[in-house]
């Protein structure tokens, strides 16, 4: 029977690497067979020497060799746009057009935007040399060389972030040149050598300076999240303090915090984070719902200063970011009873309050739901006939109710006297299951 | 043909947080990278920041350093630019442009007005 | 930080006239591979910037030809050849070699 055209495998964006070819694949159905043809730009392709494109039987387009850069059609596009390319299959009956496929070519530009600086260091302090890689496409990675041989990262110690290496505590090892190197399948640039020396920190002047400096902290502000780390992430804040005393002695700081208890009660032991900022800094790694006390100390090497003054913080409640873990069903004498385990600590994002439990529709139970306050983790609920029971259990903060547990079912016999809640022992059933076995 | 539209500009108070947004359209957003550039009432031009195209590189002045985030959604064809710890002279149009390597930035959207003010 | 500067700060023009903008930086523009990046925009009344010269002498597309750009290492230039109505605004240059990157505080440019 006849039938116009459909498309079943779409070209796909592709990087022309070389020196083989590159390949665009399009394959469509449709009564007659119909013709593939290929556009580039919107613009049909002549298939004819010197056209470096080439079309296979089966609809695949070859390209042999870069084609030649038409005048862009957004403005001064980048080089590493070849163009846009489309296939139709056409029958007698019509027409179907695939998406389109943009083919580009690997670049790596010369110019780094921020070269690494010589320094020098303090043993035990942190240090960070900064590299911006140049423009490239696809996206550069960047490694770190030390005197000529790439950098062994160790966990804890150094970190790369946006191009840049930050060391966390400096060693004497550590001295020597260090090159940042940008990768990408176009190949690698490197930056300049930058030679970073490291002393030994003086430490007879230091401590007489830091106990000069009094800092004052500021202010303490909740950062709205970076929507890129996902729907809920770890509460931040922003930390800005002022320095007053001698001339600046102090080479790194640190923020010290922990939450409040009771009034009268024994105070946590204090967190300590090094800040990356010398008057203002991020600390993240926090929990929603705690009141925090916050300071601040300066340090050079290992002498420390007086800490500042301490700043309180309350954190908003947020709605737990997990659900009740281990949801159960089990049957009573007329009654179903609903157990459950509180979401992991780290999830609870607050206080939790109780507890919200819904049966689901089109079951025995009507539409319902309860509330169990306090920290109790079951609920009793009475049954008046056979047949299946689905429940949902959410914890509750001061924010409302969080995610809600996967579906839980019982099927309760017509004796009532053998509940079916653990088909071939893999635990309680789910939605799913309960409703393959309802239909067979 | 090439458009970025910015919003989310407002009245905000000294310390105060505002995230502004740039659409971008007629382009394929995602080989481009980005940049804020600011203009304070009767003056000058600023930059801001500047985002590579994937968005693991990011590039601020001192004077914003550490209280603005410049961060993209290529999925979602949207710039963005979080701004924390307002201060009055950060009152200004915003601009969000589009780069050309790191070479110029070649075309700039109508702007977005951010006031700051108690 | 590299700082730019712009003369005249001002510039009354006649139609028709040749006008010529200077831009100079605290240092040299030219990096470790001897590239230079120095743009000029115009921004005209109520609107945003618009490239007109990008990497010293470039036109940008649709840029008429009686803009140009020239200059090397901390001292650039631009010239208009023939002053039109459309071409009152203030111009700035920027200079992206260096991070941070830098605009000059810019030169106002109107008919006398």
């Known amino acids: 029977q006849d039938s116009p055209p459909q498309i079943l495998v779409h070209p796909q964006d592709q990087l022309f690497q070389g020196p083989g070819p590159a390949r665009m694949s399009c394959q469509a159905s449709g009564q007659p067979p119909p013709t593939i043809r290929w556009l580039l730009n919107g613009q049909p392709l002549s298939m004819v020497p010197p056209d470096p494109h080439h079309l296979l039987p089966d609809g695949t387009l070859l390209l042999l060799q870069p084609p030649a850069r038409g005048h862009a059609h957004d403005g001064q596009a980048l080089s590493t746009d070849l163009g846009v390319y489309t296939c139709e299959a056409s029958n007698r009956l019509g027409t179907a057009v695939s998406r389109g496929a943009r083919l580009s070519v690997a670049v790596l530009r010369e110019d780094f935007q921020i070269q690494p600086r010589d320094m020098v260091a303090v043993v035990g302090e942190q240090f960070t040399l900064e590299c911006g890689p140049p423009w490239g496409h696809p996206e550069p990675t960047v490694s770190w060389w030390k005197d000529g041989k790439p950098l062994a990262l160790q966990p804890g110690r150094h970190t790369v972030s946006g191009g840049s290496l930050l060391m966390a505590r400096a060693e004497k090892s550590d001295e020597g040149t260090y090159m940042c190197v940008a990768t990408n399948s176009a190949g690698h640039r490197e930056s300049r050598a930058a030679r970073v020396s490291i002393q030994e920190p003086q430490d007879y002047t230091e401590p007489v300076e830091l106990l000069a400096v009094r800092i004052q902290l500021e202010n303490v502000t909740l950062l709205n999240p970076d929507p890129a780390e996902g729907p809920k992430p770890r509460p931040a804040v922003w930390l800005s303090w002022k320095v007053s005393g001698p001339a600046a002695p102090a080479q790194s700081y640190t923020a010290l915090f922990r939450t409040q208890t009771a009034p009268g009660g024994q105070g946590a032991p204090w967190a300590e984070e090094l800040l990356a900022g010398w008057q203002s800094a991020e600390l993240g790694g926090l929990h929603w719902g705690q009141d925090y006390e916050f300071k601040v100390r300066p340090s050079s090497g290992r002498a420390r200063g007086p800490d500042s003054n301490v700043l309180l913080l309350r954190l908003p409640e947020k709605v737990p970011s997990a659900p009740p873990q281990e949801v159960t069903l089990k049957p009573g004498n007329g009654t179903v009873f609903v157990s459950w385990v509180p979401p992991p600590a780290e999830n609870h994002n607050g206080i939790i309050r109780g507890y919200q439990v819904w049966s689901l529709g089109n079951t025995s139970l009507p539409p319902a739901n309860w509330t169990v306050v306090g920290e109790q983790t079951q609920l009793e609920i009475a049954t008046h006939m056979p047949g299946s029971y689905c429940v949902q259990v959410a914890a509750v903060t001061g924010a409302g109710a969080g995610e809600p547990s996967r579906p839980v079912c019982l099927l309760l016999e017509q004796a009532m006297e053998r509940a079916t809640q653990e088909p071939s022992e893999h635990g309680p059933w789910t939605l799913e299951q309960l409703r393959a076995t309802l239909k067979r | 043909e090439v458009q970025l539209v910015e919003s989310g500009g407002g009245l905000v108070q000294p310390g105060g947080s505002l995230r502004l947004s740039c659409a971008a359209s007629g382009f394929t957003f995602s080989t481009y990278a980005m940049s804020w550039v600011r203009q304070a009432p009767g003056k000058g031009l600023e930059w801001v920041a500047t985002?590579?195209?994937?968005?693991?590189?990011?590039y601020y002045p001192d004077s914003v350093k550490g209280r603005f985030t410049i961060s993209r959604d290529n999925a979602k064809n949207t710039l963005y630019l979080q701004m924390n710890s307002l201060r009055a002279e950060d009152t200004a149009v915003y601009y969000c442009a589009r780069l050309i390597y790191y070479d110029y930035l070649d075309y700039w959207g109508q702007g977005t007005l951010v006031t700051v003010s108690s | 930080d590299i700082v730019m500067t712009q003369s005249p700060l001002s510039l009354p023009v006649t139609l028709g006239e040749p006008a010529s903008i200077s831009c100079r930086s605290s240092q040299s523009l030219e990096n470790e591979n001897k590239n230079l990046y120095l743009n000029w925009y115009l921004q005209k009344p109520g609107q945003s910037p618009q490239l007109l010269i990008y990497?010293?002498?470039n036109r940008f597309s649709g840029v008429p030809d009686r803009f140009s750009g020239s200059g090397s290492g901390t001292d650039f230039t631009l010239k208009i050849s023939r002053v039109e109505a459309e071409d009152v605004g203030v111009y700035y240059c920027?200079?992206?070699?260096?991070?941070?990157?830098?605009f000059g505080p810019g030169t106002k440019v109107d008919i006398k």
């Open positions: 985002i590579s195209q994937g968005g693991t590189y990011t």
């Open positions: 990497r010293v002498s």
């Open positions: 920027l200079q992206v070699t260096h991070v941070p990157w830098t």
